[in-house]
Amino acid sequence: KSPVFGPQEVSSVEGNSVSIKCYYPPTSVNRHTRKYWCRKGASGRCITLVSSEGYVSSNYAGRANLTNFPENGTFVVNIAQLSRDDSGHYKCGLGINSRGLSFDVSLEVSQGPELPNGTEVYTVDVGRTVTIKCPFKTENAPKTKALYKKIGQTSVLVIDSRNYVNPNYKDRIRLRIPGTGQLIFTVVIDRLRLSDHGLYLCQAGDGSNRDEKNADLQVLEPEPELVYEDLRGSVTFHCALGLEVANVAKFLCRVNSRETCDVVINTLGKRDSAFEGRILLNPQDKDGSFSVVITGLRKEDEGRYLCGAHSDGQLQEGWPIQAWQLFVNEESTIPRSPTVVKGVAGGSVAVLCPYNPKESQSLKYWCLWEGAQNGRCPLLVESQGLVQEQYEGRLSLLQEPGNGTFTVILNQLTTQDAGFYWCLTNGDTRWRTTVEIKIIEGEPNLKVPGNVTAVLGETLNIPCHFPCKFSSYEKYWCKWSNTGCQTLPSQDEGPSEAFVNCDENSRLVSLTLNPVTRADEGWYWCGVKQGHFYGETAAVYVAVEEKKVAGSRYVSPAKADAAPDEKVLDSGVREIENKAIQDPRLFAEEKVVADTGDQAGGSRASVDSSSSEEQGGSSK
C-alpha cells in the first residue's frame, strides 16, 4: 500500500476554492523528489495538472499552485475558481505519475443553491448552535413572530411566539423577543442535526404588511482533520467541543464499515479491548477540551475517528463532534522492538525503548499503564535519577545502547509486575511506545543469595551462578543507585577449557568487597550483557554491621543444619556473620566465602568469573 495519504473526498461549490493536503514519509529522497497533482482520464492515464517543478497545465493557469513542505512531509495543492468541470478523480503523488506512490482523491464541485434575494446564509457544524436573526417593522412588534422551514413548495412551522414548538426541534430551540425599541427577534437552535439543513423563513405579523426574511442554514459534517502517524508510534487527538458541553460525558469512537461509530474510550469507563494498555483519555481543561493518546499504533488502527459529548458517552445525532482521518505509515521511522517481554517470577526483564535519535539529550521516562477510569500512567523511573520508592533496588533506566534506544531493567519480578508499560521522552510525543510484560512459568537463570549481611572491615564474597547458555555473554556486577548501576571492577581471568566447553550445569561470577565499608551497604546486581545490550539480572541486598567480638568462623556451604549462632533470613537464606549461604536443599552449588583477613594485593571491590569447580574456599 502506498505511504502517501490525503483526503479521499473533497467537495466544494462553484466559484469557491479548495486546499488539498497530501502527506508522505519525510525521507531524504521523498523530501526532494517531484510532487504532482494529476487527473485520471478514462484511459487510466493520469494527466499532470500541477507539479512541484513549476509545471501548471493551461486549464489551471492562474488558479492553482502546489507547495511542498519538506520539513513536515506534506505538500498542498490549492485550486481556485472551481467549476462543475473540475469534478472528477485525481491523484496526489511523488515521483512519476504511474509509479504508485500516490493517493486517490475524489473532487466534487456542486452548483450553489438558488437562493431568494437578501437570504442570510448560516454555516454551522453539526451539534453546534445557530442564532437566526429576524428583523421586523414597528407595526409588527405586537404581532406573532414565527420561523418556518421551507420543504419543497410548502412551509412547515418550526416555532412561534405563541409557544408552539415543532416536535423535531423539541428541547433544542427557543424564540427570543427583545425588549421594546429593538426591532429584531432571534431563534436559537442548539445541537444542530444534518436534517436541520435547509431554507428557513422568519415572519413577523401576517397579511400584506408582514415582515419576512429568508435564512439558508447549512449544517456541515465536520471536515476530518488528516492525521499521518508512523507505525508503532503514538497519536494524540485534541478535542475541543466548547464550554456548553464541559460537564457532559466525552468519548472517542471509530467509524466502522456500517457507518456507525464504535466507542474507543469514554469518560464513563468504557474502553475497546483492542486499545488495552495503549490509550489514555486526558482530563479535560477548563474550556471543556480533552485529548486522547494512543500509543503502539497498528495498521488496523487506521480509520475515521470522532470525538464528541453526550450523556450516554457515545455518538448521538445533534451533539457536537470533531473528526479525524488517521493514516498509519508502514514505512515507519520508529524501529521494531518487542511489544511483549516475558520474564519469570524472581527473574528480570530488559526492555528496549526507542526514542527519536535526533533527541539524544531528551529526558527518558518509563511509566506503568493503569486501566482504571480513563487510564493513567504513573511514573516509575526517569533518566535524571528518579526511581519511585517501591522500585528502589530493582529498576534502572540506562541510556545504553543509545542512538535512538534506551534500556529499562526490572528485576525481582512478581506476578504483580505483569502489565503494560510506556516508554516516552520529554521530546517528540509521537515516539511513545508500549510494551507488555508477561510473567511466565520458570526459574530465573541467574542465581544469587538472598539478603546478605557483611561485617565492617572484613571481606565479603557474593556468588552469582549462571547457566551455560550465558557463557559467551559478558558477566558483570554493579552497585545500584537512583542514577543507574555502577559496574564494579572485574577480575575476569578469561575462559578456561571448562569455560569454553561449558561442560558444567552452572558457572559462577563472584563479587568481592574487601574490606567492607559502610558505603558498601545497598543493592548489587549480577547481570549478563552482549555489548550494550543487556540480558538478565539478579539483585542482592548487602547490609553492613559492626564486627562482633567473636572471630569469624568458616562454615562449610554444604552444611545443611543451622549453626548455633546462625539466624534464619528469608526463604532458605541463612546468615553466619557475613557469610550468606543459601539452604543447600534449595541451592546445592552455592559457595559463599568470608575471609577475616585482607586479600593480598586484592582490590576493594572485585568481580571474579570462573567455573564452579574452580571456585575454591577463598577468592583468587
Epitope: 493518546v293 511514573l379 528518579l386 520529554n426
Partner: nanobody
Framework: EVQLVESGGGLAQAGGSLRLSCTAS????????MAWYRQTPGNERELVAR???????HYVDSAKGRFTLSRAQDKNTVDLQMNSLEPDDAAVYYC???????????????WGQGTLVTVSS
C-alpha cells in the same frame, strides 16, 4: 497551573554566601523534581542542583562541596545555599519544578522568572 516564585538573589563578594529560595504554589499534588538552573548571557540554561521526591539530591561538579540544596517539610519550597561564591557563579538563577501527570502520561515542566546573582571580585 503551578507558579514558582524565587527570592534571595543579589550581590555577593567572591568567597561570600547567598541563599536562594523558591516556593511553588497552585494546584500541586506532588512535585517529582525541584531544581535550580542558571544562565549567563549567550549561553543555554545549565543545571546546578536538583532534588527528587524521594529526597535524592544531585549537584553538578562545579557546585559540589559549595552549594547545598534543602527542602521544606511540605516539599514545595527548595532553598539553595551558595557558599564560597566565585565570579563564575554570577548568572540568572531559575527555579524549575517537574510534575508528572499520571493522567496525561507526561512530565509537565514549570519555570520561575529568575533571580540575578552578581559576584564581585
Amino acid at each position: 497551573e503551578v507558579q514558582l516564585v524565587e527570592s534571595g538573589g543579589g550581590l555577593a563578594q567572591a568567597g561570600g554566601s547567598l541563599r536562594l529560595s523558591c516556593t511553588a504554589s497552585g494546584t500541586i499534588s506532588k512535585i517529582d523534581v525541584m531544581a535550580w538552573y542558571r544562565q549567563t548571557p549567550g549561553n543555554e540554561r545549565e543545571l546546578v542542583a536538583r532534588i527528587f521526591s524521594n529526597d535524592v539530591t544531585h549537584y553538578v561538579d562545579s557546585a559540589k562541596g559549595r552549594f547545598t540544596l534543602s527542602r521544606a517539610q511540605d516539599k514545595n519550597t527548595v532553598d539553595l545555599q551558595m557558599n564560597s561564591l566565585e565570579p563564575d557563579d554570577a548568572a540568572v538563577y531559575y527555579c524549575n519544578a517537574q510534575i508528572w501527570s499520571d493522567m496525561r502520561g507526561r512530565m509537565d515542566t514549570y519555570w520561575g522568572q529568575g533571580t540575578l546573582v552578581t559576584v564581585s571580585s
